[in-house]
């Protein structure tokens, strides 16, 4: 049970909290998910480092509560979504409180530097935010609850410290708790007030319902400082590995089943890829090659590691690269596959590689990618790189083997050569043609060789033949006499082949041509 001491959502006028400095937190009127007007505080001083913006509530009377809860609903912008901001951008803020017997003059500058604040916690945007429609805009709203105490003074102030985030404090609710009357674990317990300390436990005597087994005597439930019931001793329940039988007995879970905790109602069949060979198992062990992540409950199937990513596509633009790939064929039975990029800078011959410099930038990040795409920049020009794309899931850390990966070799800032502008016939025989050509206007590197494509004009282009030349001349042999051949040439550098040149036609000599040429050569 909760009793509210302050709730900004019920405020009809300005909250009138104190901001220091004035250029920090700003009170703004907004809308909640029901289009009710709410008072919010926002701050977004992300361009300047060393931010220290404080926001202090009005005085809150504790009404005899010893332990206080603060529920904060807020939205934080990802630093990555903010244009051109420095690394000092934050996605967290701090919560403090200050105990006092009376209202104090918070406008005085001395209060900010001398008040003995007590830090409650650093508050971060949780991964499990809810998408809420605030006045026509879908926002990622985080709800975080923190508690503090014991309190002895008449009341207190809350203080929120921003040190470089772009965020909005949508609502703050301050309350305390009592443990309600409940039926739990086969016993009935009365309503009980919480204790003075966060560690204090207030004993409540319970009565087992018929046919529940007393774990210990006397049967006790403890109301902790957070207003939650705890059962450290004397529980009326069946222990792990055993289940209630008609609420009168606890029988062992048969082989192939398990019961993980006292709170579970009954035995369950072992999940996929696990087994329990004996009776009374509290957990099913994973089969070889299958694992549980640290936070996987015993009820879920054991899972395996993913296979490697597939079909990598790389797009090189000077000293930047975009890598895209397809997800692994096998996810290991999990839906938390992420990707890590291992960047290695190599020697020209690729015989040895080393880890990339720290200044290489990965967008959105290098590790824990959720999308099959990464943009990599600030690489060295004209440098070979190898990128390993690892597929990781929640159980990869449990496997003795390294993560499956796919590698891609890339050389930065190296364009393919431009087209060869023209070809000349040097000579021709009945069965050969000798050609020459100039180097491409933009070789974009050292030309390794040329590839010549040729085919008889009467025939289909798809039946073409290929020849290679280390220089910019080539003799094509094995041709038929008196035939017209269509010829194209393209250059190759380490970056690959350029485009083929335009099609040019050349003809071998006929038998008559050849004889007349011989006659002309006679003295």
């Amino acid at each position: 049970m909760e009793e509210t001491l302050m709730d900004t959502r019920t405020a009809t006028a300005e909250l009138g909290w104190t901001a220091n400095p004035a250029s920090g937190w700003e009170e703004v009127s907004g809308y909640d998910e029901n289009l009710n007007t709410i008072r919010t505080y926002q701050v977004c001083n992300v361009f300047e480092p060393n931010q220290n913006n404080w926001l202090l509530t009005t005085f809150i009377n504790r009404r005899g509560a010893h332990r206080i809860y603060t529920e904060m609903r807020f939205t934080v912008r990802d630093c990555s979504s903010l244009p051109n901001v420095p690394g000092s951008c934050k996605e967290t803020f701090n919560l403090y409180y200050y105990e006092t017997d009376s209202v104090i003059a918070t406008k005085k500058s001395a209060f900010w530097s001398e008040a003995p604040y007590l830090k409650v916690d650093t508050i971060a945007a949780d991964e499990s935010f809810s998408q809420v429609d605030f006045g026509g805009r879908l926002m990622k709203v985080n709800t975080e609850v923190r508690s503090f105490g014991p309190l002895t003074r008449n009341g207190f102030y809350l203080a929120f410290q921003d040190y470089g985030a772009c965020m909005s404090l949508l609502s703050v609710r301050v309350f305390f708790k009592k443990c309600p009357s409940i039926v739990q674990n086969f016993a009935v317990f009365p309503e009980t007030m919480t204790g003075a300390e966060s560690t204090s436990l207030v004993i409540a005597r319970g009565t087992c319902i018929p046919n529940a087994e007393e774990v210990d005597v006397p049967i006790k439930l403890y109301c902790n400082g957070d207003g939650e019931w705890m059962v450290p001793i004397g529980r009326c329940t069946c222990k792990a590995g055993y289940e209630p039988e008609n609420s009168v007995a606890c029988k062992a879970c048969p082989a192939g089943t398990f019961k993980a905790s006292q709170e579970a109602e009954g035995c369950s069949h072992c999940p996929s890829n696990s087994r329990s060979p004996s009776e009374a198992s509290p957990i099913c062990t994973c089969r070889t090659g299958y694992y549980r992540a640290d936070f996987d409950p015993p009820e879920v199937a054991c899972t395996s590691v993913p296979s490697g990513p597939r079909n990598v596509i790389s797009i090189v633009n000077e000293t930047s690269i975009i890598l895209e790939w397809h997800p692994p064929r096998e996810t290991g039975g999990r839906d938390d596959v992420t990707y890590n990029i291992i960047c290695k800078k190599c020697r020209a011959d690729r015989r040895s590689c080393s880890r990339c410099d720290d200044n290489v930038e990965f967008v959105p990040r290098q590790l824990g990618l959720t999308e099959c795409r990464v943009s990599i920049s600030s690489l060295w020009a004209h440098t070979p790189y190898t990128f390993d794309i690892q597929a990781i899931n929640g159980v990869s850390s449990k496997s003795p083997f390294p993560p499956q990966h796919v590698s891609v070799n890339i050389t930065t800032n190296q364009a393919a050569p431009s087209t060869v502008p023209i070809m000349h016939q040097v000579s021709a025989t009945m069965r050969s043609i000798t050609l020459s050509w100039p180097q491409p206007e933009q070789p974009n590197g050292i030309i390794l060789d040329y590839e010549i494509r040729y085919y008889e004009k009467e025939h289909n282009e798809f039946n073409s033949s290929m020849a290679r030349s280390q220089t910019n001349t080539a003799r094509i042999d094995g041709l038929r006499p008196g035939m017209v051949y269509v010829v194209q040439v393209r250059a190759r550098t380490v970056a690959g082949y350029g485009k083929f040149s335009g099609k040019m036609c050349f003809q071998t000599l006929t038998d008559d041509d050849y004889k007349s040429e011989l006659r002309e050569q006679l003295p």
Epitope: V46, F47, V76, P83, N84, L138
Partner: antibody, heavy 121, light 106 residues
Framework: QVQLLQSGAEVKKPGASVKVPCKAS????????MSWVRQAPGQGLEWMGW????????TYAQGFTGRFVFSLDTSVSTAYLQISSLKAEDTAVYYC??????????????WGQGTLVTVSS | EIVLTQSPATLSVSPGERATLSCRAS??????LAWYQQKPGQAPRLLIY???TRATGIPDRFSASGSGTDFTLTISRVEPEDFAVYYC????????FGQGTKVEIK
């Protein structure tokens, strides 16, 4: 009050250079990025890019690399746009604008009055 | 580059009438869209950011909505000082402006 003050009109010959200042006052210069926007006569707005006033790191939009340079002098709270090798098609009003970031979105909330640069032989 | 297309190019309305301006993006920009007003011989003025949040000092007759690729700016009752050119601008990927919609007196 918060304002951005730009210099008066400039007339330049093709091939020349121009440096347009934008002096900020009424706020902490390094707390906000500065954007540059071009508007050719009778045309719409074209975003040229921005500069982080804290780090000096510029970002240029497509079509505004090479001849266009953003720079700063934080000691006098001034941002500069320099255009070299001027062409007739560079004739336009050039605006500086403060970039305001909030948790709800971004926008250019304070604008200079604009500087008309005319390129003519 | 994300292209923003505004329609109509010109909107003729009488004072007191409602004006609805449209802006369509070539691909999704989420809620990363702003609206600006520009009067002849003046610098633009920020009206809306985050697709629907009014900038400081903007009258509540100006409202905006939309997300993804389709956005709308509405002037509930057009005042004489509202006749101007209105531009949308996205900041989802780099920044680009629409070509503008001129609101003129009918």
């Amino acid at each position: 009050q918060v304002q951005l003050l730009q210099s008066g009109a400039e007339v330049k010959k093709p091939g020349a250079s121009v440096k347009v200042p934008c002096k900020a006052s009424g706020y902490t210069f390094t707390s906000y990025a500065m954007s540059w926007v071009r508007q050719a006569p009778g045309q719409g707005l074209e975003w040229m890019g921005w500069i982080n006033t804290n780090t000096g790191n510029p970002t240029y939009a497509q079509g505004f690399t090479g001849r266009f340079v953003f720079s700063l002098d934080t000691s006098v709270s001034t941002a500069y746009l320099q255009i070299s090798s001027l062409k007739a098609e560079d004739t336009a009003v050039y605006y500086c604008a403060r970039v305001r970031l909030t948790v709800y979105g971004d926008g250019m909330d304070v604008w200079g009055q604009g500087t008309l640069v005319t390129v003519s032989s | 580059e994300i292209v923003l297309t505004q329609s109509p190019a010109t909107l003729s309305v009488s004072p007191g009438e409602r004006a609805t301006l449209s802006c369509r993006a070539s691909q999704s920009v989420s809620s990363n869209l702003a609206w600006y007003q520009q009067k002849p011989g003046q610098a633009p003025r920020l009206l809306i950011y985050g697709a629907s949040t009014r900038a400081t000092g903007i009258p509540d007759r100006f409202s905006a909505s939309g997300s993804g690729t389709d956005f709308t700016l509405t002037i509930s009752r057009v005042e004489p000082e509202d006749f101007a050119v209105y531009y949308c601008q996205q900041y989802g990927s780099s920044w680009t402006f629409g070509q503008g919609t001129k609101v003129e007196i009918k």
